[in-house]
Interface confidence: low
């Protein structure tokens, strides 16, 4: 806490400018009007304030807005955002995507901080769902964002938003997350033709049920082994040897190298040896 002291004569700030970098902490506290600071927040980032000086400016805003900052101030916080705690951010009501982008830009290149996570949570909850524009923005800044959400949170993603998802955005998703995302992707891409559909749906197939895999096996998709290994075990088990052969196409030879791994191992165990022998791979059920 900075002590309340009178502002020295002639030092009262008329505007937020570079002269303030020469003010001591107590002078900033005494001579900078909080309302002036709030209206000229966009200037703060252009001025090389020290971290200690930024603490004073934050303190002034906190006093002016004890219930949380208005969006007009939040949008121009810039590097002052890094001084905010998750508790501060929980008081905000951020509705503008531009505000979100501005604050994410400040943290760009760093891992998602608790502050950013809280900001995103507040923003998404305020919107009621994770719409396409928001998802586009978040995955651009944090490719792993989607996979940081719980299955419950993912359930609020509308199918239309799935168009914004790139394969790399799903790299760290676990099976239960893909279980939620797959039906949404299937709905989103349902009007595409066979080969285009497979390209789009491929990254989501870790959540696909058996009947969808059977349907894909009839479309000459030539699924690669990496994708096959990410399929749900319970979805793979009922597939026949012929269906797996059609599903994988020329990649079927890769089953041998994966015969001890799930889901291939479990699938092999449930096949008739005669059927497995037709593959000519030496697989033992």
């Amino acid at each position: 806490e900075v002590e309340k002291t009178a502002c020295p004569s002639g030092k009262k700030a008329r505007e937020i400018d570079e002269s303030l970098i020469f003010y001591k902490k107590w002078e900033l506290e005494a001579c900078v009007d909080a309302a002036l600071l709030a209206t000229q927040m966009d200037r703060v980032n252009a001025i090389p304030f020290t971290y200690e000086q930024l603490d004073v400016l934050k303190h002034k805003l906190d006093e002016l807005y004890p219930q949380g900052y208005p969006e007009s101030v939040i949008q121009h916080l810039g590097y002052l955002f890094l001084k905010m705690s998750p508790e501060d951010i929980r008081k905000w009501n951020v509705t503008s995507l531009e505000t979100l982008k501005a604050l994410l830009e400040v943290n760009k290149g760093h891992e998602m901080s608790p502050q950013v996570a809280t900001l995103i949570d507040r923003f998404v909850k305020g919107r009621g769902q994770l719409d396409k524009d928001t998802l586009d923005t978040l995955t651009a800044f944090y490719p792993g964002y989607l996979c940081s959400l719980s299955p419950e949170e993912l359930s609020s993603v509308p199918p239309s938003s799935i168009w914004a998802v790139r394969p790399q955005d799903l790299d760290t998703c676990d099976p239960r997350q893909l279980d939620v995302l797959y039906p949404k992707a299937r709905l989103a891409f349902q009007n595409m033709n066979g080969s285009e559909y497979f390209v789009k749906i491929q990254s989501f197939l870790g959540g696909a049920p058996t009947e969808d895999l059977k349907a894909l096996s009839q479309q000459n998709v030539s699924m690669d082994l990496a994708t096959f290994m990410k399929l749900r075990t319970d979805a793979v088990l009922p597939l026949t040897v012929a269906e797996v052969q059609k599903l994988l196409g020329p990649h079927v030879e890769g089953l041998k190298a994966e015969e001890r791994h799930r889901p291939v191992r479990d699938w092999i165990l449930r096949q008739r040896q005669d059927d497995l022998d037709t593959l000519g791979l030496g697989l033992q059920g």
Epitope: S150, D174, T233, D234, L237
Partner: antibody, heavy 119, light 107 residues
Framework: QVQLQESGPGLVKPSETLSLTCTVS??????????WSWIRQPPGKGLEWIGY???????NYNPSLKSRVTISVDTSKNQFSLKLSSVTAADTAVYYC???????????WGQGTMVTVSS | DIQMTQSPSSLSASVGDRVTITCRAS??????LNWYQQKPGKAPKLLIY???SLQSGVPSRFSGSGSGTDFTLTISSLQPEDFATYYC?????????FGGGTKVEIK
């Protein structure tokens, strides 16, 4: 051969926070196929799943404990941790860390650590 | 949450006996059912995963069957080292849940 080892205080006072760490050796916490769980067992009772974490940091907690639980992962140290806040005597248990592996089961367990909540 | 109900809660048997433990899920869990053995003072040990697959290193006298909601763990010929408590666990959906356990005691 992947092994897990729990560490942390054996005695915690009521209303305080229980903190445990699980160190993974012989393998990586960043395995695509694994989630890393905490499971507890009160004396003479059954097993209760607390929650899991994936190496990306994605978590899933048991709703019965969600308001008090935080699980985190440190890939650089090959560790994951449990924090359980506002503990009471009912939280006295053996706490296990475990790997949910490619087969969808807890195939590797730590030896367990007994945590007593008492003043 | 999916409730897992094991029966019986305890049983007495002799060496060489065939022992069957059942586990029922409150809703369908496909084949996402695992079985564990726990001895006093030790961590549980995985026996069977995906309802019927034997974990590496586990004796072949242990077997599992079932799908959907009803599952069975069978020990074809009980050995002295098999006296322990057995738990089923579903990994179909979170929260992951365990059965209450079945204690196998010496008759």
């Amino acid at each position: 051969q992947v092994q897990l080892q729990e560490s942390g205080p054996g005695l915690v006072k009521p209303s305080e926070t229980l903190s445990l760490t699980c160190t993974v050796s012989g393998g990586s916490v960043s395995s695509y196929y694994s989630t890393w769980s905490w499971i507890r067992q009160p004396p003479g009772k059954g097993l209760e799943w607390i929650g899991y974490i994936y190496y990306s940091g994605s978590t899933n907690y048991n709703p019965s404990l969600k308001s008090r639980v935080t699980i985190s992962v440190d890939t650089s140290k090959n560790q994951f941790s449990l924090k359980l806040s506002s503990v009471t005597a009912a939280d006295t248990a053996v706490y296990y860390c475990a790997r949910e592996g490619k087969n969808g089961a807890f195939d590797i367990w730590g030896q367990g650590t007994m945590v007593t909540v008492s003043s | 949450d999916i409730q897992m109900t094991q029966s019986p809660s305890s049983l007495s048997a002799s060496v060489g006996d065939r022992v069957t433990i059942t586990c029922r899920a409150s809703q369908s869990i496909s084949s996402y059912l695992n079985w564990y053995q726990q001895k006093p003072g030790k961590a549980p040990k995985l026996l069977i995963y995906a309802a019927s697959s034997l974990q590496s290193g586990v004796p072949s006298r242990f077997s599992g069957s079932g799908s959907g909601t009803d599952f069975t763990l069978t020990i074809s010929s009980l050995q002295p080292e098999d006296f322990a408590t057995y738990y089923c666990q579903q990994s179909y959906s979170t929260p992951l849940t365990f059965g209450g356990g079945t204690k196998v005691e010496i008759k």
